[in-house]
């Protein structure tokens, strides 16, 4: 019998605003799943090692996974 | 400016019904989180319910779970409270309060606030 | 769930510092923040995290922490600073928020 699990979403609120990706230390993209029906992004600062929860559907934001994964495929061999 | 406004504060008979709401201006209103938060005569604040900025979170003290609930329409930025089966101890002035930035564990922080409704559970 | 725990009353002397602490097992996981109440106003958040003002808020006002208890300080406290003082923060053990049982501070 599978377990009944409820909703278990992380961000209680989101940002809209840009993130320098340099000042990045994690990046952590979560898809929706049947424990919660929203894409979640939750950043990690290198300063004092904040996270921010950031709206997935704001401009600034997918500016930002482009150039996060720009940034990576340029260091994958 | 930030501003929160309750309203449907009033009188009601204990085991009635009442729903208050928080109509929210000066900020993009459907990014925030939102709680209400109460105070009794004479005792302290006591938190009652928190709402992520979609609806999709709910989170609710003890006391009120069962008998509260908390939504919001984002549409017309306005955070509710539909509070049944009232009892005399649910009497208090009511706050809506905005969450305090986006990180997901300090949802806590509490940095705008309503001047909150009073709502009176008597026979 | 856990509780926050606050002296009930504290008194200052016009232009002295004092201490208002905030004792709970969840401060040893989250830090605290603090709230003003003035009488007939709405609740005010005067410090969060670490030690963090919001804008408009006098430097007199700051905080700290150590092991399970918060402590919000005012050096050099003012009339206008007479008020009920509340700290909150969430339990560890789930997602309830949590509010001390305020302080009620009077300025001398």
């Known amino acids: 019998v599978p377990l009944s699990r409820t909703v278990r979403c992380t961000c209680i609120s989101i940002s809209n605003q840009p993130v320098n990706p340099r000042s990045l230390e994690k990046l952590e993209i979560i898809p929706a799943s049947q424990f919660c029906p929203r894409v979640e992004i939750i950043a990690t600062m290198k300063k004092k090692g904040e996270k921010r929860c950031l709206n997935p559907e704001s401009k600034a934001i997918k500016n930002l996974l482009k150039a996060v994964s720009k940034e990576r495929s340029k260091r994958s061999p | 400016q930030v501003q929160l406004v309750e309203s449907g504060g009033g009188v009601v008979r204990p085991g009635r019904s009442l729903r208050l709401s928080c109509a929210a201006s000066g900020f993009t209103f459907s990014s925030y989180g939102m709680h209400w938060v109460r105070q009794a005569p004479g005792k302290g604040l006591e938190w009652v319910a928190v709402?992520?900025?979609?609806?999709?979170?709910?989170y609710y003290a003890d006391s009120v779970k069962g008998r509260f609930t908390i939504s919001r329409d984002n549409s017309k930025n306005t955070l509710y409270l539909q509070m049944n089966s009232l009892r005399a101890e649910d009497t208090a002035i009511y706050y809506c309060a905005r969450v305090m930035g986006t990180d997901p564990h300090s949802y806590y922080y509490m940095d705008v606030w309503g001047k909150g409704t009073l709502v009176t559970v008597s026979s | 769930s856990s509780e926050l725990t606050q002296d009930p009353a504290v008194s200052v002397a016009l232009g002295q510092t004092v201490r208002i602490t905030c004792q709970g097992d969840?401060?040893?996981?989250?830090?605290a923040s603090w709230y003003q109440r003035k009488p007939g106003q709405a609740p005010v958040l005067v410090i969060y995290?670490?030690?963090n003002r919001p804008s408009g808020i006098p430097d007199r006002f700051s905080g700290s922490s150590s092991g399970n208890t918060a402590s919000l300080t005012i050096t050099g406290a003012q009339a206008e600073d007479e008020a009920d003082y509340y700290c909150?923060?969430?339990?560890?053990?789930?997602?309830?928020?949590?509010f001390g049982g305020g302080t009620k501070l009077t300025v001398l």
């Open positions: 995290g670490k030690n």
């Open positions: 709402i992520s900025y979609d609806g999709s979170i709910k």
């Open positions: 969840s401060l040893r996981s989250y830090y």
């Open positions: 909150n923060s969430r339990d560890s053990s789930g997602n309830h928020v949590l």
